[in-house]
Interface confidence: medium
């Protein structure tokens, strides 16, 4: 179903791009899911503008967002996570657009936390370990995680290294010496659920020693 | 109109296979989870097996699990069920059901005829 | 995996009569229960979704109530096309999964 206004307060509406995006969080707040959506064109006017989500919901045929400044946004158990739903913008009673979403397909995950940085001397290399929420989760525990690093000099140049685990290890020899480097992670579903990526963890920096300096465990900066 | 056409039962002999398919026509199949429900001759309704509408998510009865496959193709609106390793027990009118979970909970809303598969030697 | 338990396994009743039909889960399952009816040589027919909403075309006599672990259908006024047999259905999310119970077989009396 979609469609445009023609009531007087919107008779502009025909004018408007109400084109939108969305991710579900899962089991974000406990059982709790979280579905978070927003306009894709920052200057649509939002006065009055409502967004509804029907079917593929237990126990209720639809369920309203709650608008937060720019986004809107549910928190509820109440979805079904099989089948598609359907978003739509609305105005009053009014839909102006629909989208049919399978919630399971814009998953975005939790940003990884507790990154960290060892450097171990015998071996000659940096053990980079970092944690998920999502290991506890009873649905999106499968994750892809990529883990970008850089030389702090070099603004852009960001090497990544994609794994399925929580621990990294780099290669000394791969590294500049006596350097400062930024790490940070971020991960995505990998397994039945798809969507998009984390935020980025928050960024570890550490510093390499230099050649034959042996300078045991990476102190954070 | 919304209609479910199933095809492929027949008789066939323990341990063998055999692959069912329903046809779905006048709804967005790729819209829709489907699913495989039997009737053994005077018994009650047993589900077999589901499949959402992306395939990603299936789902197996315990008694049909590691035998049966199901699998789908969008493009050609169409649901099939692999039988291998067939047994008496598994002789029962087979019926592909759409889901319409809008409604709020999973409930099959179309059935089509059946199939009969009789499994005997 | 959750049971279904219906009761009784089959009753008899007169047109006119009002019959109530009782399925029990083995654990809750909020109102996540769907009403079916079968006539011999026909495939089953949705009239309850949600435990008591109606589906479309479905005659007002038939209802449904319960949630958690107990649910009925009742029927307020028996018609002579509703004999027939009665099932009560679940499901479960994730992973897919569907439980029917043994239903119940409405016979005329």
């Known amino acids: 179903e979609s469609g445009y206004a023609q009531n007087g307060d919107l008779e502009d509406a025909e004018l408007d791009d109400y084109s939108f995006s969305c991710y579900s969080q899962l089991e974000v707040n406990g059982s709790q899911h979280s579905l978070t959506c927003a306009f894709e064109d920052p200057d649509v006017n939002i006065t009055n503008l409502e967004f509804e989500i029907c079917g593929a919901l237990v126990e209720v045929k639809c369920l309203n967002f709650r608008k937060l400044q720019e986004i809107y946004f549910i928190e509820t158990k109440k979805f079904l996570l099989i089948g598609k739903s359907n978003i739509c913008v609305k105005v009053g009673e009014k839909s102006l657009t629909c989208k049919k979403i399978d919630l399971t397909t814009i998953v975005k995950p939790e940003a990884p936390f507790d990154l960290s940085v060892v450097y171990r001397e015998g071996a000659n290399d940096f053990v980079v370990t970092f944690n998920t929420s999502h290991l506890q989760k009873k649905y999106v525990k499968v994750l892809m995680h990529d883990v970008a690093y850089r030389q702090e000099k070099d603004e852009n140049k960001w090497t990544h290294v994609n794994l399925s685990s929580t621990k990294l290890t780099l290669l000394q020899r791969k590294l500049q010496p006596a350097a400062m480097y930024e790490i940070k992670v971020r991960s995505i579903p990998d397994h039945y659920f798809k969507g998009f990526w984390s935020e980025w963890s928050p960024s570890y920096y550490f510093r390499t020693p230099e050649i034959n300096n042996s300078s045991g465990e990476m102190d954070p900066i | 109109e919304v209609q479910l056409v199933e095809s492929g039962g027949g008789l066939v002999q323990p341990g063998r296979s055999l692959r069912l398919s329903c046809a779905a026509s006048?709804?967005?199949?790729?819209?829709?989870?489907m699913h495989w429900v039997r009737q053994a001759p005077g018994k009650g309704l047993e589900w077999v097996s589901g499949?959402?509408?992306?395939?990603?998510?299936?789902g197996y009865a315990d008694s049909v699990k590691g035998r049966f496959t199901i699998f789908r193709d969008n493009a050609k609106n169409s649901l099939y069920l692999q039988m291998n390793s067939l047994r008496a027990e598994d002789t029962a009118l087979y019926y592909c059901?759409?889901?319409?979970?809008?409604?709020?909970?999973?409930?099959?809303?179309?059935w089509g005829q059946g199939t009969t598969v009789t499994v005997s030697s | 995996a959750i049971q279904l338990t219906q009761s009784p396994s089959s009753l008899s009743a007169s047109v006119g009569d009002r019959v109530t039909i009782t399925c029990r889960a083995s654990q809750g399952i909020s109102s996540a229960l769907a009403w079916y009816q079968q006539k011999p040589g026909k495939a089953p027919k949705l009239l309850i979704y949600?435990?008591?909403s109606l589906e479309s075309g479905v005659p007002s006599r038939f209802s449904g109530s319960g949630s958690g672990t107990d649910f009925t259908l009742t029927i307020s006024s028996l018609q002579p096309e509703d004999f027939a047999t009665y099932y009560c259905?679940?499901?479960?999310?994730?992973?897919?999964?569907?439980?029917f119970g043994q239903g119940t077989r409405l016979e005329i009396k």
């Open positions: 006048g709804f967005t199949f790729d819209d829709h989870a």
């Open positions: 499949i959402s509408w992306n395939s990603r998510g299936i």
């Open positions: 949600d435990a008591s």
């Open positions: 059901a759409k889901d319409e979970y809008s409604r709020g909970y999973y409930v099959l809303d179309v």
């Open positions: 259905q679940q499901f479960n999310s994730y992973p897919l999964w569907i439980t």
